[in-house]
């Protein structure tokens, strides 16, 4: 057959759907690869063809659109499963073509099993909400297009395995779930089960969102350097190991890039001829405030090293901070016996 523009396997779209639930999958060509939409392509005489490769097989085969109850069907640029089966897992290809043009893309579809508490291998979207903020709403995701607006589905919300009924600060309101003055205890997986009728059958859509309560913007601060500080002096003898921790607290700021670095005499450690090791560790609070520690160490410090200026720097979207470490050479008192001998004029 003639050449076809093959966009390959689009692993950016790792589509996961639950077993025994409806799934509608749009051909990614029109969303991410081509400049025109399905309607334009169709009116230009282009045809959309679907086929698939089963899991652990190499053979491409056509999709069977003649299954009982039209279990798999195509509608415009959407491939429908009503419902999915576990063995629908595989790589699906949509190809747009006519006699002179061809373009295709493949994408992986994974049909996932879930237990009665909605536990599964599904990757859930994460919704971050600010602690103590007035009201946060989450909406049952990815249910558009499954039923017409005239159909009013029933929606049940769960936290983990428990139906949300009489939760003090969490209120189900149809497709929305409202959180009033959220606390860290509101963290968890929230699942909406949407039930709707179609052609005399009831279908269920299960969607889970992970809620993570984070620090509020009103509490956002520039970095706070805990160490080094003015109270601690790093007093060392030449030949000893010098270890200076730079410990910095960053309040949670959405999409902030938190940085910590050392300078030695105004230069980055890589630009200094000193044998320096820097190790970094990070810990997080319950509201995703971050404590970042960079430990600077010099195995065998020289008198010259002890005269250098060691400065810890930190930066986030709120500002910058810096703090010099107090480093000095330990003064070794003269030994008493030698002093005494000199005092008596011994030779």
């Amino acid at each position: 057959s003639e050449r076809c523009d093959d966009w390959g396997l689009d692993t950016m779209r790792q589509i996961q759907v639950f077993e025994d639930e409806p799934a509608r999958i749009k051909c990614p060509l029109f969303e991410h690869f081509l400049k025109y939409n399905y309607s334009t392509a169709h009116s230009s005489g282009l045809t959309l063809i679907w086929y698939w490769t089963r899991q652990d097989r190499d053979l491409e085969e056509p999709i069977n659109f003649r299954l009982p109850e039209n279990r798999i069907s195509k509608e415009k640029d959407v491939l429908w499963f009503r419902p999915t089966l576990l063995n629908d897992t595989g790589n699906y290809t949509c190809m747009l073509r006519n006699t002179t043009y061809c373009s295709k893309v493949a994408f992986p579809l994974e049909v996932v099993q879930k237990d009665s508490c909605f536990n599964s291998a599904m990757r859930f979207p994460v919704h971050k909400m600010y602690i103590e903020h007035g009201i946060h709403k989450i909406t049952c995701p990815n249910v558009d297009g499954y039923f017409p607006s005239s159909v009013k589905p029933s929606v049940t919300w769960y936290k983990g395995c428990t139906e949300i009924v009489d939760f003090h600060n969490v209120l189900p309101e149809g497709m929305n779930l409202s959180f009033f003055i959220p606390l860290v205890s509101n963290n968890g997986n929230y699942t909406c089960v949407v039930t709707y009728p179609e052609n005399g059958r009831l279908f269920h859509l299960t969607r889970t969102v992970t809620v993570k309560v984070v620090g509020s913007p009103k509490d956002a601060l520039p970095p706070q350097i805990y160490s080094p500080n003015d109270r601690v002096v790093y007093e060392k003898e030449p030949g000893e190991e010098l270890v200076i921790p730079c410990k910095v607290y960053f309040s949670f700021i959405m999409d902030s890039h938190n940085e910590v670095w050392w300078t030695i005499d105004g230069k980055k450690p890589d630009d200094v001829t000193v044998d320096i090791t820097i190790n970094e560790s990070v810990s997080y609070s319950s509201t995703e405030d971050e404590t970042r520690t960079q430990i600077l160490s010099i195995k065998k410090v020289t008198p010259e090293d002890l005269r250098r200026n060691y400065v810890c720097h930190a930066r986030n979207t709120k500002g910058e901070a810096e703090q010099a470490a107090k480093v000095k050479q330990k003064v070794i008192p003269p030994r008493y016996t030698v002093e005494l001998a000199c005092g008596f004029g011994a030779t």
Partner: antibody, heavy 118, light 107 residues
Framework: EVQLLESGGGLVQPGGSLRLSCAAS????????MSWVRQAPGKGLEWVSA????????LYADSVKGRFTISRDNSKNTLYLQMNSLRAEDTAVYYC???????????WGQGTLVTVSS | EIVMTQSPATLSVSPGERATLSCRAS??????LAWYQQKPGQAPRLLIY???TRATGIPARFSGSGSGTEFTLTISSLQSEDFAVYYC?????????FGQGTKVEIK
């Protein structure tokens, strides 16, 4: 210095209404959630209601839900509690308290006495 | 809602002695527990938050411990001004709830 000063308490008949106020000073009022906590004579403390720092989110104890309304005016640094359909069991000293998730109720007012009696 | 239970209801202690007050939650409240002191005719005062962190200006003789469901407030050497009612309170889940109080009285 953080200060919270309640006012508006008094004697009211069952079924009546009362509006409590709490004037705040010494801190950025709009950065803190606020609550009302009450204490019936000779009894323990009972949380009544809370409002978020932005005034959008409100919560109530089941015992007052539908009868009491908490609100705030951040421009006036003032917290309010509108109490309707008052009952004898609402008789208590009402305290306003500042709260943070990290530190709970860190500052309290001196309280105002509400007596519901015929 | 989470029920907080304090024991004992009353604790009789001599000045200079150690006092240990207990608080139990009906379900885990992590470390989101506070202790308050209340004297007659006064508003409660925050002593401890986060189960073990002393609030600003609270003397070192007050210490808190515990996490999950079991918590303790210890007053290492009772002073005359420490005789009062002490309340624990969880702020892990709404509604925030208080224990019924422990009265520390002079023996």
């Amino acid at each position: 210095e953080v200060q919270l000063l309640e006012s508006g308490g008094g004697l009211v008949q069952p079924g009546g209404s009362l509006r409590l106020s709490c004037a705040a000073s010494g801190f950025i009022f709009s950065h803190y959630g606020m609550s009302w906590v009450r204490q019936a004579p000779g009894k323990g403390l009972e949380w009544v209601s809370a409002i978020s720092y932005d005034g959008e989110g409100t919560l109530y104890a089941d015992s007052v839900k539908g009868r009491f309304t908490i609100s705030r005016d951040n421009s006036k640094n003032t917290l309010y509690l509108q109490m309707n359909s008052l009952r004898a069991e609402d008789t208590a000293v009402y305290y306003c308290a500042r709260f943070r998730y990290y530190t709970a109720f860190d500052y309290w007012g001196q309280g105002t006495l509400v007596t519901v009696s015929s | 809602e989470i029920v907080m239970t304090q024991s004992p209801a009353t604790l009789s202690v001599s000045p200079g002695e150690r006092a240990t007050l207990s608080c139990r939650a009906s379900q885990s409240v992590s470390s989101n527990l506070a202790w308050y002191q209340q004297k007659p005719g006064q508003a409660p005062r925050l002593l401890i938050y986060g189960a073990s962190t002393r609030a600003t200006g609270i003397p070192a003789r007050f210490s808190g411990s515990g996490s999950g469901t079991e918590f303790t407030l210890t007053i290492s050497s009772l002073q005359s001004e420490d005789f009062a009612v002490y309340y624990c309170q969880q702020y892990n889940n709404w509604p925030w709830t208080f224990g019924q109080g422990t009265k520390v009285e002079i023996k």
